[in-house]
Interface confidence: medium
């Protein structure tokens, strides 16, 4: 079972001192969102027992394996169901604590009831404050049963549940009708999936015989030991004030485990710590009683004395739970309660025994779960014990389970069961992830999900160039860190695989699936320089550049030209995709803008050094369009145009340009200059008679401006065909050539 304990501090004089702590003894528990262990969760479960909303509870993490819930402001905050979730993957386990109000109308005689499938469960609610109304029993928040107030027996309301099945498990409550739900008695019923003493999918396997109040888990056959006991069968008592599967945790405070409720994974439930009892776990055991909730009786023989934490303390010459075994009877010594080996290993297991007569090699045997008996291959005989060594054949998964070391002499026999866990070495289910790459190194995250068993002790990264037959290079890394593969070849594909290991001999798993990671190109090192540039229009710029001459092929895929408009804070990038190019035309620029220009060579995604920058000023754009353009036919070959000067001119106009085109014609338009910019009228001559013409014009300062609106006019009829239009300014006395 998962080593997870939920502790409730029941010193309830002040709710603000109340706290819940969840402690995990699991390797890597609560480490957070990495691949090796999800965090411990501790929360109030309001799905069944709802309490009035209050200020949020405070969650504090103490290291990786402990989380504490505080911030209870009033007694009603405490009432209800709390849960702690810990363990990873299939071992993720929820531990539940049910808190009753000490001032409730009804109080449970016993909060947690663990029963076997098919048993009869009896829940008993003791009357604390009487009301003469019905008592409503609910199961998981839903109505279940009603009892009349006359039906109380000896001041208790009993709910009998015959032939219980696992779906009957849950939170039960007994409430007086018309009373606050907070005054209910709350119970937790845990129904094991099997009958008494059995476990496994078809309940075909026999439980190991859990001692000291331990409960056999119906899924894996392990004993869930009460707080304060350890060992495969809970046969060993912890020192006072200690708990956890290996007695590794210590109760907080000077009074040890007094006033603490311990909740463990199902099917155990909750109890006081060893040596304590009572609804608030503040009463020491009566003489002759010991263990969690003081449920166990010592019944010590042969002068043994009862310790309320550990049971019988035997005098010299005696041993056993009740000091009933003479030391003359052979005894298995210091056998570990649990051993762990990796799949397909051939471990050596030692079993030591003492007694009178002295055990010899042939009198000690090892029995596997399938009944196979192994005989020892050698024995070490010392004055006080004989240690038999067993060579175990290659382990398979079916060897997981309870093994037994047995010693037999003429003085009697002893046996000790111990749990063997055969673990599957971890195998990555996915390839490692590429985080960043450079031309000569790859940064890789080896953290991947895996099949098999943790914890992960080492991570090996194997890599070699793709399609290579050379040996793999290997780097061993810490499981939680990213790895940098160094001294690689540029622009090369590498096959990369992860291998995970767990502790112990034979803990190395198979290699995970490969992935292809490619190093970046080499960085281009040549620095171009700008040869020159010239303006080809108000928004066009031609740029040319050169590269230094170096031996060997050019390392580069093309050039990147950058134009920086400092006034607007804008950058324009132009990609020239040929490494042979040495000139480029940049269009669509902003007229009148001061640009900083540079060029750099690129290779793949890497940029080389930029050229020294150049500063370029584009000429401003032309003036606005002339206004109110008007056309008037004067004869069969002349049309007069009139207009008004553009507004808001940036400088003096150098000339006007008139565009003439036959309406609907397919030919190119004709442009005619008006070189006297002060004029606002001109006559276009040499036109064809009875022909419709389109006119528009624009002004020029340093550059040509915007076109005016287009006007339309027809020449008068009956004229001769003209040679082509010419223009005459209003102030001019002679015509201008076309």
């Amino acid at each position: 079972a998962v080593d997870l304990t939920l502790l409730a501090n029941l010193r309830l004089t002040d709710p603000q001192r109340f706290f819940l702590t969840c402690v995990s003894g699991e390797a890597g528990a609560g480490r957070g969102s990495d691949a090796w262990g999800p965090p411990l969760l501790l929360e109030k479960d309001d799905r069944i027992v709802r309490t009035p909303p209050g200020p949020p509870l405070r969650l504090a993490r103490n290291g990786s394996h402990q989380v504490t819930l505080r911030g209870f402001s009033k007694p009603s905050d405490l009432v209800g169901v709390f849960s702690c979730v810990g363990g990873a993957g299939a071992r993720r386990t929820r531990v539940i604590y049910v808190h009753n109000s000490p001032g409730a109308h009804l109080l449970p005689d016993k909060v947690t009831h663990t029963v076997n499938k098919g048993d009869t469960a009896v829940l008993s609610a003791r009357v604390h404050k009487e009301k003469q109304t019905d008592v409503i029993w609910k199961s998981n928040g839903s109505y279940f049963y009603t009892l009349d107030w006359h039906e109380a027996q000896d001041g208790r309301f009993l709910l009998q549940l015959p032939n219980v099945q696992p779906p009957s498990s849950g939170i039960y409550s007994a409430t007086y009708l018309e009373a606050s739900p907070l005054g209910s008695a709350f119970f937790r019923l845990i129904v094991r999936g099997c009958g008494a003493g059995r476990w496994g999918p078809g309940c075909t396997k026999e439980c190991p015989g859990c001692l000291h109040g331990g409960v056999c888990h119906d899924h894996d056959g392990e004993c869930v030991c009460p707080p304060g006991f350890t060992g495969t069968r809970c046969e060993q008592a912890c020192r006072e004030g200690r708990f956890g599967q290996s007695c590794q945790e210590q109760c907080p405070g000077i009074s040890g485990c007094r006033g603490l409720t311990f909740c463990l994974p199902d099917p155990y439930g909750c109890s006081c710590g060893s040596g304590w009892r009572g609804s608030q776990c503040q009463e020491a055991c009566a003489p002759g009683h010991f263990g969690a909730d003081c449920r166990l009786q010592c019944q010590c023989q042969n002068g043994g004395t009862c310790d309320r934490f550990s049971g019988c303390v035997c005098p010299s010459g005696w041993h056993g739970v009740h000091c009933e075994k003479s030391d003359r009877i052979p005894q298995i010594l210091n056998m570990a309660s649990e051993l762990e080996f990796n799949l397909e290993t051939m471990p050596r297991i030692n079993c030591a025994a003492a007694g009178n007569p002295f055990p010899v090699r042939g009198s000690i045997e090892l029995r596997k779960p399938d009944g196979t008996v192994l005989l020892s291959t050698k024995a070490i005989v010392e004055p006080e014990k004989t240690t038999a060594e067993f060579e175990v054949p290659r382990l398979v998964l079916a060897d997981s389970g309870f093994w037994e070391c047995r010693v037999s002499t003429s003085g009697g026999q002893d046996s000790r069961r111990f749990k063997v866990n055969v673990k599957v070495p971890p195998v990555p289910l996915a390839a490692p992830r590429l985080l960043t790459k450079q031309s000569r190194q790859l940064v890789v995250s080896p953290l991947v999900s895996f099949s098999g068993d943790g914890p992960i002790s080492t991570v090996r990264l194997h890599y070699r160039p793709q399609d290579s037959t050379m040996d793999w290079s290997t780097i061993v890394v810490d499981p939680s860190e990213n790895v940098t593969l160094m001294n690689l070849r540029p622009k090369t594909g590498y096959s990369v695989r992860v291998q995970l290991s767990r502790p112990g001999e034979g803990g190395e798993g198979a290699w995970g699936p490969p992935t292809l990671m490619t190093t970046d190109c080499p960085e281009p090192l040549l620095q171009p320089w700008l040869e020159g540039w010239h303006v080809e229009g108000t928004d066009r710029l031609r740029v040319s550049w050169s590269l230094p001459l170096v031996p060997g092929p050019l390392v580069g895929d093309g050039f990147l030209l950058r134009l920086w408009d400092g006034t607007r804070g804008q950058e324009r990038r132009e990609n020239v995709s040929s490494p042979q190019a040495r000139t480029a035309l940049l269009t669509g620029l902003t007229p009148g803008t001061h640009y900083q220009l540079d060029v750099q060579l690129y290779h793949c995604t890497l940029l080389g050094p930029a050229s020294p920058p150049a500063h370029v000023l584009l000429p401003p754009s032309g003036p606005p369009a002339p206004r109110h353009l008007h056309a008037q036919a004067l004869s069969d070959s002349e049309i007069q145009l009139t207009w008004k000067h553009p507004e808001a001119l940036p400088g003096p106009i150098s000339k006007y340009v008139v565009e003439v085109q036959v309406a609907g014609g397919a030919g190119d338009p004709l442009w005619i200059d008006v070189d006297r910019p002060e004029e606002t009228s001109t006559i276009i001559r040499g036109l064809n008679a009875s022909t419709r013409y389109l006119f528009r014009m624009r002004a020029s300062i340093q550059g040509l401006g915007d076109w005016s609106n287009t006007v339309e006019e027809s020449t008068l009829g009956n004229g001769l065909q003209a040679e082509g239009p010419v223009q005459e300014s209003r102030a001019a006395e002679e015509g201008l050539d076309q």
């Epitope: 019905d134 109505y143 279940f144 009349d148 039906e151 009708l177």
Partner: antibody, heavy 119, light 108 residues
Framework: EVQLLESGGGLVQPGGSLRLSCAAS???????KMWWVRQAPGKGLEWVS?????????YYADSVKGRFTISRDNSKNTLYLQMNSLRAEDTAVYYC????????????WGQGTMVTVSS | DIQMTQSPATLSLSPGERATLSCRAS???????LAWYQQKPGQAPRLLIY???NRATGIPARFSGSGSGTDFTLTISGLEPEDFVVYYC?????????FGGGTKVEIK
């Protein structure tokens, strides 16, 4: 589907007896308190009797105390009302009812059975 | 025993109008244990409201309940043709329970 179905009503002379049944289906009958409620023609509703899940606790309205007996057979999912010493004022439609959802009020009713006491 | 008195005995209204039915207890009743039922001719009663103000499953939003202590109210915000029937209040929550005498809502 949760259902209650009454039967056993009919015409009976004053002083006579009658046994009503209420067959329950669609829920765990043995867990619920069961009620009989009646309604005289043109009149309002009147509570008659209640029996608790185990059958060990029963209550009656003053108007029927000593004459009517409520009982249940949890193995048959059936509720009964044994009516003795019937009077004309017992003439009514008799309904069985439960609070199926745990709200306390009657959210499931039978269709009713008519009892007429007349000479 | 607690007596429950409903008023008026008959309420004459037109469809679409708002109906307000009153139920008064002879002594204080927990609002958690006050229910309203609707009964159509020839049918068993149907639970409308429990706990004085909670609509039962499938009951339209035009039905609402309120009140505490000794005075409770059932309101039908806009009467539909099928709402012109009899309504009962009930005190429940102990082994004996009491119904009101009923209010008949009829079409004006």
């Amino acid at each position: 589907e949760v259902q209650l179905l009454e039967s056993g009503g009919g015409l009976v002379q004053p002083g006579g007896s009658l046994r009503l049944s209420c067959a329950a289906s669609g829920f765990t009958f043995s867990q619920y308190k069961m009620w009989w409620v009646r309604q005289a023609p043109g009149k309002g509703l009147e509570w008659v009797s209640v029996i608790y899940p185990s059958g060990g606790v029963t209550y009656y309205a003053d108007s029927v105390k000593g004459r009517f007996t409520i009982s249940r057979d949890n193995s048959k999912n059936t509720l009964y009302l044994q009516m003795n010493s019937l009077r004309a004022e017992d003439t009514a439609v008799y309904y069985c009812a439960i609070s199926y959802s745990p709200v306390g009020a009657f959210d499931i009713w039978g269709q009713g059975t008519m009892v007429t006491v007349s000479s | 025993d607690i007596q429950m008195t409903q008023s008026p005995a008959t309420l004459s209204l037109s469809p679409g109008e708002r109906a307000t039915l009153s139920c008064r207890a002879s002594q204080s009743v927990s609002s958690s244990y006050l229910a309203w039922y609707q009964q159509k001719p020839g049918q068993a009663p149907r639970l409308l409201i429990y706990g004085a103000s909670n609509r039962a499953t499938g009951i339209p939003a035009r039905f609402s309940g309120s009140g505490s202590g000794t005075d409770f109210t059932l309101t039908i915000s806009g009467l539909e043709p099928e709402d012109f029937v009899v309504y009962y209040c009930q005190k429940y929550g102990s082994s004996s329970l009491t119904f009101g005498g009923g209010t008949k809502v009829e079409i004006k």
